[in-house]
């Protein structure tokens, strides 16, 4: 399987909420001995590999923000810790998973990575990730709502988030 990032860039005004999204593509094994570990973290555009370094999102580590579930299940974080930081990660039945960040500030700008680990029989792991940029803007040049830009593999016309 692969991870797709429907949007590679999110441009948002300060104070707005945003939901960053990743999607699992390809055959997803829903067998009894297969589980998925999904999480989010900040990173930097490394010289060798994007998303290699794992930095916290609003002081929460990738471990704090994880979802862990069977192949056919949906899940979301109910952690008080995440919600106290204005964060919530969620996953649905269709391979979509997301992190919602509330009340954005300029400090939230940066590169965000989603990570999926497929675990088979507890001793085989397949790891994939996706990356996207968040730009939080303030002042007269800031958009009134978040504007999202599709990844290059999709239609390049920008779409305004609802």
């Amino acid at each position: 399987f692969k991870v797709a990032t429907p949007y590679s860039l999110y441009v948002c005004p300060e104070g707005q909420n945003v939901t960053l999204t990743c999607r699992l593509l390809g055959p997803v094994d829903k067998g009894h001995d297969v589980t998925f570990y999904k999480t989010w973290y900040r990173s930097s555009r490394g010289e060798v590999q994007t998303c290699s370094e794992r930095r916290p999102i609003r002081n929460l580590t990738f471990q704090d923000l994880h979802l862990h579930h069977g192949g056919h299940q949906a899940a979301n974080t109910s952690h008080d810790l995440a919600q106290r930081h204005g964060l919530e990660s969620a996953s649905d039945h269709h391979g979509n998973f997301s992190i919602t960040m509330r009340n954005l500030t300029l400090l939230d700008s940066g590169l965000y990575c989603c990570l999926v680990v497929e675990i088979r029989h507890h001793h085989s792991e397949h790891r994939v990730h996706g990356a996207m940029e968040l730009q939080v803007q303030t002042g007269k040049d800031a958009p009134s709502n978040c504007v999202v830009y599709p990844s290059s593999s999709q239609d390049s016309e920008n779409i305004t988030a609802a």
Epitope: S52, Q63, H68, L115, V117, H122, R127
Partner: antibody, heavy 118, light 106 residues
Framework: QVQLVQSGAEVKKPGASVKISCKAS????????MNWVRQAPGQGLEWIGL????????SYAQKFQGRATLTVDTSTSTAYMELSSLRSEDTAVYYC???????????WGQGTLVTVSS | EIVLTQSPATLSLSPGERVTMSCSAS?????MYWYQQKPGQAPRLLIY???NLASGVPARFSGSGSGTDYTLTISSMEPEDFAVYYC?????????FGQGTKLEIK
């Protein structure tokens, strides 16, 4: 803060069994695998196996298959490792360590010394 | 089983020296992890995913490599760095460690 606190040292006779506990606190127990690693005196690290508190699934190194048994009690956030048919070469410090999937063992217990001697 | 071979087994150094140690895998691995262990203590995670510093690890430590050959470098030895260093792989079951490289004071 994250803590893994292991039970105390044990002295056992050859052929006996030992059960070591590892009590976790300061993190979501079911979001990690609990791994067990041993270190014989003056030797390197040897991975024994892991258990997922999320679903109880286990995986063992071939060498320990059938002799080591890993269990968890999620109500107390405690992991256990039982090793049976002990022999003198099982004398070692046994560590528990947590590991997030796709990551490394980032927190370790203080270790439990098991001495097997007749 | 993937066998990890560390070299050298022992290195005698002085504080301030640069040190490089290697870890060679018997078959290709995706990522390498490095741990430091001092006498009487549990191991401590230093490097994850080949080249990234774990939380609280000083910037004098760095990791690199790919495939079967990986390296841990300490740019300038501090007195607290004298310890045993282990590489470890999670790419293939069973999860194995190298035999360790001991750094001792010259």
């Amino acid at each position: 803060q994250v803590q893994l606190v292991q039970s105390g040292a044990e002295v056992k006779k050859p052929g006996a069994s030992v059960k070591i506990s590892c009590k976790a606190s300061g993190f979501s127990f079911t979001g990690y695998t609990m791994n067990w690693v041993r270190q014989a005196p003056g030797q390197g690290l040897e991975w024994i196996g892991l258990i997922s508190p999320y679903d109880g699934g286990t995986s063992y190194a071939q060498k320990f298959q059938g002799r080591a048994t890993l269990t968890v009690d999620t109500s107390t956030s405690t992991a256990y490792m039982e090793l049976s048919s002990l022999r003198s070469e099982d004398t070692a410090v046994y560590y528990c360590a947590r590991r997030a999937y796709g990551y490394a063992m980032d927190y370790w217990g203080q270790g439990t010394l098991v001495t097997v001697s007749s | 089983e993937i066998v990890l071979t560390q070299s050298p087994a022992t290195l005698s150094l002085s504080p301030g020296e640069r040190v490089t140690m290697s870890c060679s895998a018997s078959s290709s691995v995706s990522y390498m992890y490095w741990y430091q262990q001092k006498p009487g203590q549990a191991p401590r995670l230093l490097i994850y995913d080949t080249s990234n510093l774990a939380s609280g690890v000083p910037a004098r430590f760095s990791g690199s490599g790919s495939g079967t050959d990986y390296t841990l470098t300490i740019s300038s030895m501090e007195p607290e760095d004298f310890a045993v260093y282990y590489c470890q792989q999670w790419s293939s079951y069973p999860f194995t460690f190298g035999q360790g490289t001991k750094l001792e004071i010259k």
